[in-house]
Interface confidence: medium
Protein backbone atom coordinates (compact mmCIF):
# COMPACT_ATOMS: atom_id res chain seq x y z
CA UNK A 1 0.00 0.00 0.00
CA UNK A 2 1.10 3.56 -0.70
CA UNK A 3 -0.56 6.65 0.74
CA UNK A 4 -0.01 10.38 0.59
CA UNK A 5 1.38 11.75 3.83
CA UNK A 6 1.68 15.13 5.52
CA UNK A 7 1.27 16.63 8.97
CA UNK A 8 -0.82 19.69 9.92
CA UNK A 9 -0.72 21.39 6.53
CA UNK A 10 -2.93 24.29 5.47
CA UNK A 11 -3.38 23.10 1.90
CA UNK A 12 -3.59 19.85 -0.02
CA UNK A 13 -0.74 21.20 -2.18
CA UNK A 14 1.58 20.27 0.67
CA UNK A 15 0.06 16.80 1.06
CA UNK A 16 1.17 15.19 -2.17
CA UNK A 17 4.16 13.23 -0.88
CA UNK A 18 3.70 9.49 -1.54
CA UNK A 19 4.75 7.23 1.33
CA UNK A 20 5.39 3.49 1.32
CA UNK A 21 3.24 2.00 4.05
CA UNK A 22 4.24 -0.82 6.35
CA UNK A 23 2.76 -4.29 5.93
CA UNK A 24 0.93 -3.52 9.19
CA UNK A 25 -0.96 -0.65 7.54
CA UNK A 26 -4.36 -1.41 6.01
CA UNK A 27 -5.59 2.13 5.37
CA UNK A 28 -4.74 5.54 3.98
CA UNK A 29 -6.19 8.11 6.37
CA UNK A 30 -6.96 11.80 5.92
CA UNK A 31 -7.66 13.93 8.97
CA UNK A 32 -9.14 17.35 8.31
CA UNK A 33 -9.56 19.67 11.27
CA UNK A 34 -11.02 23.16 11.27
CA UNK A 35 -12.15 25.73 13.80
CA UNK A 36 -14.63 28.53 13.35
CA UNK A 37 -18.15 29.83 13.92
CA UNK A 38 -20.48 28.43 11.32
CA UNK A 39 -19.56 29.65 7.84
CA UNK A 40 -18.83 33.17 9.06
CA UNK A 41 -15.48 33.03 10.83
CA UNK A 42 -12.72 30.47 10.26
CA UNK A 43 -9.92 30.33 12.80
CA UNK A 44 -7.84 27.73 11.02
CA UNK A 45 -7.72 24.59 8.97
CA UNK A 46 -5.30 21.70 9.22
CA UNK A 47 -4.84 18.64 7.02
CA UNK A 48 -2.93 15.47 7.88
CA UNK A 49 -2.52 12.29 5.85
CA UNK A 50 -0.90 9.01 6.78
CA UNK A 51 -0.80 5.23 6.55
CA UNK A 52 -2.65 3.51 9.39
CA UNK A 53 -3.35 -0.03 10.64
CA UNK A 54 -6.97 0.92 11.37
CA UNK A 55 -9.54 3.55 10.48
CA UNK A 56 -9.66 5.70 13.64
CA UNK A 57 -13.15 7.23 13.49
CA UNK A 58 -15.65 6.49 10.73
CA UNK A 59 -17.37 9.86 10.50
CA UNK A 60 -16.98 13.60 11.18
CA UNK A 61 -16.85 14.89 14.73
CA UNK A 62 -18.08 18.29 15.90
CA UNK A 63 -16.93 19.69 19.24
CA UNK A 64 -18.14 23.23 19.89
CA UNK A 65 -16.42 25.54 17.42
CA UNK A 66 -14.07 22.80 16.19
CA UNK A 67 -14.81 20.07 13.69
CA UNK A 68 -12.79 17.11 12.52
CA UNK A 69 -13.35 14.85 9.57
CA UNK A 70 -11.61 11.53 9.12
CA UNK A 71 -11.76 9.56 5.90
CA UNK A 72 -10.19 6.18 5.20
CA UNK A 73 -9.55 4.23 2.02
CA UNK A 74 -7.65 1.09 1.08
CA UNK A 75 -6.16 1.47 -2.38
CA UNK A 76 -2.98 2.86 -3.95
CA UNK A 77 -2.58 6.60 -3.21
CA UNK A 78 -6.32 6.80 -2.58
CA UNK A 79 -6.16 9.68 -0.04
CA UNK A 80 -5.49 12.29 -2.72
CA UNK A 81 -8.09 14.82 -1.60
Amino acid sequence: LMCFSCLNQKSNLYCLKPTICSDQDNYCVTVSASAGIGNLVTFGHSLSKTCSPACPIPEGVNVGVASMGISCCQSFLCNFS
Epitope: T19, I20, C21, S22, D23, Q24, N26, P53, A54
Partner: antibody
Framework: EVQLVESGGGLVQPGGSLKLSCAAS????????MHWVRQASGKGLEWVGR??????????YYADSVKGRFTISRDDSKSTVYLQMNSLKTEDTAVYYC??????????????WGQGTLVTVSS | DIQMTQSPSSLSASVGDRVTITCKAS??????VDWYQQKPGKAPKLLIY???NRYTGVPSRFSGSGSGTDFTFTISSLQPEDIATYYC????????FGQGTKVEIK
Protein backbone atom coordinates in the same frame (compact mmCIF):
# COMPACT_ATOMS: atom_id res chain seq x y z
CA GLU B 1 0.76 -6.10 31.68
CA VAL B 2 1.14 -7.65 28.23
CA GLN B 3 2.18 -11.30 28.19
CA LEU B 4 2.82 -13.75 25.35
CA VAL B 5 3.48 -17.34 26.35
CA GLU B 6 4.55 -19.90 23.77
CA SER B 7 4.22 -23.66 24.22
CA GLY B 8 4.33 -26.86 22.20
CA GLY B 9 8.00 -27.01 21.30
CA GLY B 10 9.99 -30.21 21.47
CA LEU B 11 11.92 -32.83 19.55
CA VAL B 12 10.48 -34.06 16.26
CA GLN B 13 11.84 -36.18 13.42
CA PRO B 14 12.43 -34.78 9.93
CA GLY B 15 9.20 -34.91 7.95
CA GLY B 16 7.15 -34.76 11.15
CA SER B 17 4.67 -32.20 12.43
CA LEU B 18 4.35 -29.97 15.47
CA LYS B 19 1.84 -27.34 16.56
CA LEU B 20 2.96 -24.36 18.62
CA SER B 21 0.62 -22.16 20.65
CA CYS B 22 0.99 -18.61 21.89
CA ALA B 23 -1.40 -17.43 24.60
CA ALA B 24 -1.78 -13.66 24.86
CA SER B 25 -3.02 -11.46 27.69
CA UNK B 26 -2.98 -7.80 28.67
CA UNK B 27 -4.27 -6.36 25.38
CA UNK B 28 -7.23 -6.68 23.03
CA UNK B 29 -5.97 -9.70 21.13
CA UNK B 30 -8.65 -9.66 18.42
CA UNK B 31 -7.57 -6.22 17.17
CA UNK B 32 -3.93 -6.92 16.34
CA UNK B 33 -1.96 -8.92 13.82
CA MET B 34 0.14 -11.69 15.36
CA HIS B 35 3.55 -12.81 14.15
CA TRP B 36 5.94 -15.72 14.49
CA VAL B 37 9.71 -15.14 14.39
CA ARG B 38 12.39 -17.80 14.78
CA GLN B 39 16.08 -17.93 15.64
CA ALA B 40 18.42 -20.85 15.07
CA SER B 41 21.10 -21.31 17.71
CA GLY B 42 23.84 -18.69 17.30
CA LYS B 43 22.10 -17.22 14.24
CA GLY B 44 20.02 -14.15 13.49
CA LEU B 45 16.29 -13.52 13.60
CA GLU B 46 14.02 -14.76 10.81
CA TRP B 47 10.41 -13.71 10.38
CA VAL B 48 8.19 -16.76 9.79
CA GLY B 49 4.74 -15.33 9.12
CA ARG B 50 1.76 -13.41 10.41
CA UNK B 51 -2.00 -13.52 10.66
CA UNK B 52 -4.17 -10.42 10.51
CA UNK B 53 -7.55 -9.81 12.12
CA UNK B 54 -11.16 -10.74 11.37
CA UNK B 55 -12.02 -7.51 9.44
CA UNK B 56 -9.38 -8.49 6.89
CA UNK B 57 -10.44 -12.16 6.85
CA UNK B 58 -7.56 -13.43 9.00
CA UNK B 59 -5.20 -12.88 6.09
CA UNK B 60 -1.94 -14.82 6.43
CA TYR B 61 1.48 -14.11 4.98
CA TYR B 62 4.55 -16.37 5.13
CA ALA B 63 8.28 -16.30 4.56
CA ASP B 64 9.25 -18.17 1.40
CA SER B 65 11.25 -20.68 3.46
CA VAL B 66 8.10 -22.01 5.19
CA LYS B 67 5.36 -21.33 2.64
CA GLY B 68 3.26 -24.42 1.96
CA ARG B 69 4.58 -26.21 5.06
CA PHE B 70 3.58 -23.92 7.93
CA THR B 71 0.10 -22.58 8.71
CA ILE B 72 -0.80 -19.81 11.15
CA SER B 73 -4.26 -19.68 12.71
CA ARG B 74 -5.84 -17.91 15.65
CA ASP B 75 -8.68 -18.31 18.12
CA ASP B 76 -9.77 -14.86 19.27
CA SER B 77 -12.06 -16.33 21.93
CA LYS B 78 -8.99 -17.91 23.56
CA SER B 79 -6.59 -15.06 22.75
CA THR B 80 -4.28 -17.64 21.21
CA VAL B 81 -2.34 -17.86 17.96
CA TYR B 82 -1.05 -21.15 16.55
CA LEU B 83 1.75 -22.24 14.26
CA GLN B 84 1.14 -25.61 12.62
CA MET B 85 4.43 -26.92 11.23
CA ASN B 86 4.37 -29.81 8.76
CA SER B 87 7.08 -31.52 6.68
CA LEU B 88 9.67 -30.31 9.15
CA LYS B 89 13.31 -30.09 8.08
CA THR B 90 16.48 -30.03 10.18
CA GLU B 91 16.92 -26.37 9.19
CA ASP B 92 13.65 -25.54 10.98
CA THR B 93 15.42 -26.18 14.29
CA ALA B 94 15.17 -22.92 16.21
CA VAL B 95 13.65 -21.03 19.09
CA TYR B 96 10.21 -19.83 17.94
CA TYR B 97 8.88 -16.54 19.28
CA CYS B 98 5.41 -15.08 18.88
CA UNK B 99 5.25 -11.32 18.68
CA UNK B 100 2.64 -8.59 18.58
CA UNK B 101 2.60 -4.91 17.66
CA UNK B 102 1.53 -2.17 20.04
CA UNK B 103 -1.26 -0.23 18.30
CA UNK B 104 -2.21 1.76 21.39
CA UNK B 105 0.66 4.23 21.16
CA UNK B 106 0.96 4.24 17.37
CA UNK B 107 3.77 1.68 17.30
CA UNK B 108 3.04 -0.97 14.71
CA UNK B 109 6.30 -2.82 15.26
CA UNK B 110 7.14 -5.98 17.20
CA UNK B 111 6.73 -4.37 20.60
CA UNK B 112 5.72 -7.49 22.52
CA TRP B 113 7.55 -10.82 22.50
CA GLY B 114 7.09 -14.18 24.17
CA GLN B 115 9.90 -16.04 25.90
CA GLY B 116 10.27 -18.46 22.98
CA THR B 117 9.84 -22.22 22.63
CA LEU B 118 12.54 -24.51 21.26
CA VAL B 119 11.82 -26.77 18.29
CA THR B 120 14.44 -29.40 17.48
CA VAL B 121 14.16 -31.37 14.24
CA SER B 122 16.47 -34.36 14.36
CA SER B 123 16.50 -38.08 13.72
CA ASP C 1 12.28 -10.33 -1.30
CA ILE C 2 13.88 -7.28 0.25
CA GLN C 3 17.36 -7.84 1.70
CA MET C 4 18.70 -5.86 4.65
CA THR C 5 22.50 -5.62 4.68
CA GLN C 6 23.69 -4.69 8.15
CA SER C 7 27.21 -3.63 9.04
CA PRO C 8 29.47 -4.16 10.83
CA SER C 9 28.75 -7.74 11.94
CA SER C 10 30.55 -7.03 15.21
CA LEU C 11 32.29 -4.16 16.93
CA SER C 12 34.22 -3.46 20.09
CA ALA C 13 34.04 -0.04 21.74
CA SER C 14 34.83 1.60 25.06
CA VAL C 15 32.28 2.81 27.59
CA GLY C 16 31.24 6.34 26.58
CA ASP C 17 32.05 5.83 22.90
CA ARG C 18 29.65 6.70 20.11
CA VAL C 19 28.57 3.56 18.25
CA THR C 20 27.04 3.57 14.78
CA ILE C 21 25.44 0.66 12.91
CA THR C 22 24.15 0.90 9.36
CA CYS C 23 21.54 -1.02 7.42
CA LYS C 24 21.01 -0.88 3.67
CA ALA C 25 17.79 -2.11 2.07
CA SER C 26 17.89 -3.69 -1.39
CA UNK C 27 14.97 -1.46 -2.43
CA UNK C 28 13.04 1.54 -1.15
CA UNK C 29 11.29 0.71 2.13
CA UNK C 30 10.26 4.27 3.03
CA UNK C 31 10.65 4.75 6.77
CA UNK C 32 9.51 1.22 7.62
CA VAL C 33 12.60 0.15 9.52
CA ASP C 34 12.86 -0.84 13.19
CA TRP C 35 15.85 -1.57 15.42
CA TYR C 36 15.91 -4.32 18.05
CA GLN C 37 18.27 -5.21 20.88
CA GLN C 38 18.78 -8.84 21.91
CA LYS C 39 20.74 -10.08 24.88
CA PRO C 40 21.88 -13.74 25.10
CA GLY C 41 19.05 -16.12 25.98
CA LYS C 42 16.44 -13.35 25.88
CA ALA C 43 13.76 -12.26 23.44
CA PRO C 44 14.51 -9.18 21.31
CA LYS C 45 13.43 -5.74 22.53
CA LEU C 46 12.12 -2.96 20.33
CA LEU C 47 14.25 0.19 20.54
CA ILE C 48 13.43 2.28 17.45
CA TYR C 49 10.39 2.11 15.17
CA UNK C 50 9.61 3.78 11.86
CA UNK C 51 13.31 4.60 11.38
CA UNK C 52 13.64 7.34 14.00
CA ASN C 53 11.05 6.98 16.78
CA ARG C 54 12.26 5.83 20.19
CA TYR C 55 9.96 3.25 21.76
CA THR C 56 8.46 3.87 25.20
CA GLY C 57 11.04 3.69 27.97
CA VAL C 58 14.07 3.49 25.67
CA PRO C 59 16.95 5.71 26.84
CA SER C 60 17.69 8.82 24.80
CA ARG C 61 21.22 7.62 23.96
CA PHE C 62 19.62 5.32 21.37
CA SER C 63 18.59 6.97 18.10
CA GLY C 64 17.81 6.08 14.51
CA SER C 65 17.72 7.92 11.21
CA GLY C 66 17.32 7.36 7.49
CA SER C 67 14.70 6.66 4.85
CA GLY C 68 14.45 4.93 1.52
CA THR C 69 17.35 2.48 1.45
CA ASP C 70 19.91 3.77 3.98
CA PHE C 71 19.41 3.63 7.73
CA THR C 72 21.60 4.35 10.74
CA PHE C 73 21.34 3.34 14.39
CA THR C 74 23.42 5.21 16.96
CA ILE C 75 24.29 4.74 20.62
CA SER C 76 25.58 8.18 21.59
CA SER C 77 27.44 7.02 24.70
CA LEU C 78 27.94 3.27 25.08
CA GLN C 79 27.05 1.85 28.50
CA PRO C 80 27.99 -1.59 29.93
CA GLU C 81 24.33 -2.67 29.81
CA ASP C 82 24.26 -2.03 26.04
CA ILE C 83 26.29 -5.17 25.36
CA ALA C 84 23.99 -7.09 23.02
CA THR C 85 23.27 -7.93 19.40
CA TYR C 86 21.35 -5.29 17.44
CA TYR C 87 19.12 -6.02 14.46
CA CYS C 88 17.45 -3.81 11.88
CA UNK C 89 14.18 -4.99 10.32
CA UNK C 90 12.13 -3.75 7.39
CA UNK C 91 8.34 -4.12 7.37
CA UNK C 92 7.52 -2.63 3.97
CA UNK C 93 7.10 -5.93 2.11
CA UNK C 94 6.93 -8.97 4.33
CA UNK C 95 9.56 -8.62 7.08
CA UNK C 96 13.31 -8.98 6.79
CA PHE C 97 15.93 -8.68 9.52
CA GLY C 98 19.53 -7.64 9.03
CA GLN C 99 22.24 -10.15 9.96
CA GLY C 100 22.82 -8.50 13.33
CA THR C 101 25.66 -6.53 14.91
CA LYS C 102 27.27 -7.85 18.07
CA VAL C 103 28.42 -4.99 20.31
CA GLU C 104 31.13 -5.68 22.87
CA ILE C 105 33.05 -3.56 25.38
CA LYS C 106 36.78 -3.06 24.86
Amino acid sequence: EVQLVESGGGLVQPGGSLKLSCAASGFTFSTVAMHWVRQASGKGLEWVGRIRTKPVNYETYYADSVKGRFTISRDDSKSTVYLQMNSLKTEDTAVYYCSAPNYYDGTYSFAYWGQGTLVTVSS
Amino acid sequence: DIQMTQSPSSLSASVGDRVTITCKASQNVGSNVDWYQQKPGKAPKLLIYKASNRYTGVPSRFSGSGSGTDFTFTISSLQPEDIATYYCMQSSTKYTFGQGTKVEIK
